[in-house]
């Protein structure tokens, strides 16, 4: 499947998952905490202030690094999965902290967490990597 299609699908699924999570957690627009979001790379569930959210490396890095083997499980398609099963010390895990000022930036940044061989596809069709 073309990367554009993968990510349109991922984004749509993300928005659905966020909506379900908001209902489960009793979140609304005026709730304190951090709203769920699609950051154009992966999906982040809503979180309370002080909560750290962990995610597995997104699909994008399976395109960038087709030979990469991930040690962590992929978060389920129907919900956000059990992020307690993920550990920041694992390769392939990215976190964001929910603070009073909103979400922190990813830690580590995606390339550091998910691995990236910048020379592997140097001559490849760069348009293939556009998301939209």
């Amino acid at each position: 499947m073309h990367s554009d299609c993968i990510f349109k699908k991922e984004q749509a699924m993300c928005l659905e998952k966020i909506q379900r999570a908001n209902e489960l957690m009793g979140f609304n627009d005026s709730s304190p905490g951090c709203p769920g979001m699609w950051d154009n790379i992966t999906c982040w569930k809503p979180a309370h202030v002080g909560e750290m959210v962990l995610v597995s490396c997104p699909e994008l890095f399976r395109i960038f690094n087709p030979d990469q083997v991930w040690e962590t499980e992929t978060i389920g398609e129907s919900d956000f999965g059990d992020s307690n099963s993920l550990d920041l010390s694992d390769m392939g895990v990215v976190s964001r902290n929910c603070t009073e000022d909103g979400w922190s930036e990813p830690f580590p940044h995606y390339f550091d967490a998910c691995g990236f061989d910048e020379y592997e596809s140097e001559t490849g069709d760069q348009d293939y990597y556009y998301l939209s």
Epitope: N40, E105, H109, S132
Partner: antibody, heavy 120, light 107 residues
């Protein structure tokens, strides 16, 4: 090897506009976030803006928000900074830098900079 | 925004001495703190990423430590080429910020 070459700097009057360019080579430009960082003469570094690998995410320092626009053309391996309503305090050496990430990242390779002087 | 404070502003030392540079954040940045070296007339160079991770091509005498709000860059034994300005940078929260720098000069 990674190469970043800035251009477009010069002397401009307050209130006018200027567009900086940064030509990238030696890496797959379309996969990396890119930053602009500036340095006023004799002063420290000031982060200005960042753009994600596909241009979908753009973030700015408060001091330039609403006046500067970061953009990129991945088909030309070029990063841009459109600067409007320039002020004397914008006088600085402007560096473009590669962000080691798809989204934002930290600058890992830097160009040599292009000097912008805002003066009447 | 997160304000980074570096101390001292200037550090006067002799070659062979140990240099200890400090960077303090106004709020926690976790480990998303990076160190750069800048020599006169040159672009900055990344020295340490994520507070303590070394980079290939950077001499082993450069090391970093810390997390949260307090960070340290240590140069174990100063070489003549190490006299420069050192900046810390946080990529934990937007807008990203740099510290004001510490100048390491020859005593």
């Amino acid at each position: 090897q990674v190469q970043l070459v800035e251009s477009g700097g010069g002397v401009v009057q307050p209130g006018r506009s200027l567009r900086l360019s940064c030509a990238a080579s030696g890496f797959t430009f379309s996969r990396f976030a890119m930053h602009w960082v500036r340095q006023a003469p004799g002063k420290g570094l000031e982060w200005v803006a960042v753009i994600s690998f596909d241009g979908g995410n753009k973030y700015y320092a408060e001091s330039v928000k609403g006046r500067f626009t970061i953009s990129r053309d991945n088909s030309k391996n070029t990063l841009y900074l459109q600067m409007n309503s320039l002020r004397a305090e914008d006088t600085a050496l402007f560096y473009c830098a590669r962000g080691y990430d798809v989204l934002t990242g930290y600058p890992d390779y830097w160009g040599q900079g292009t000097l912008v002087t805002v003066s009447s | 925004e997160i304000v980074l404070t570096q101390s001292p502003a200037t550090l006067s030392l002799s070659p062979g001495e140990r240099a200890t540079l400090s960077c303090r954040a106004s709020q926690s940045v976790g480990r998303s703190l990076h160190w750069y070296q800048q020599k006169p007339g040159q672009a900055p160079r990344l020295l340490i990423k994520y507070a303590s991770q070394s980079l290939s091509g950077i001499p082993a005498r450069f090391s970093g430590s810390g997390s949260g709000t307090d960070f340290t860059l240590t140069i174990s034994s100063l070489e003549p080429e190490d006299f420069a300005v050192y900046y810390c940078h946080q990529s934990s929260r937007l807008p990203f910020t740099f510290g004001p720098g510490t100048k390491v000069d020859i005593k």
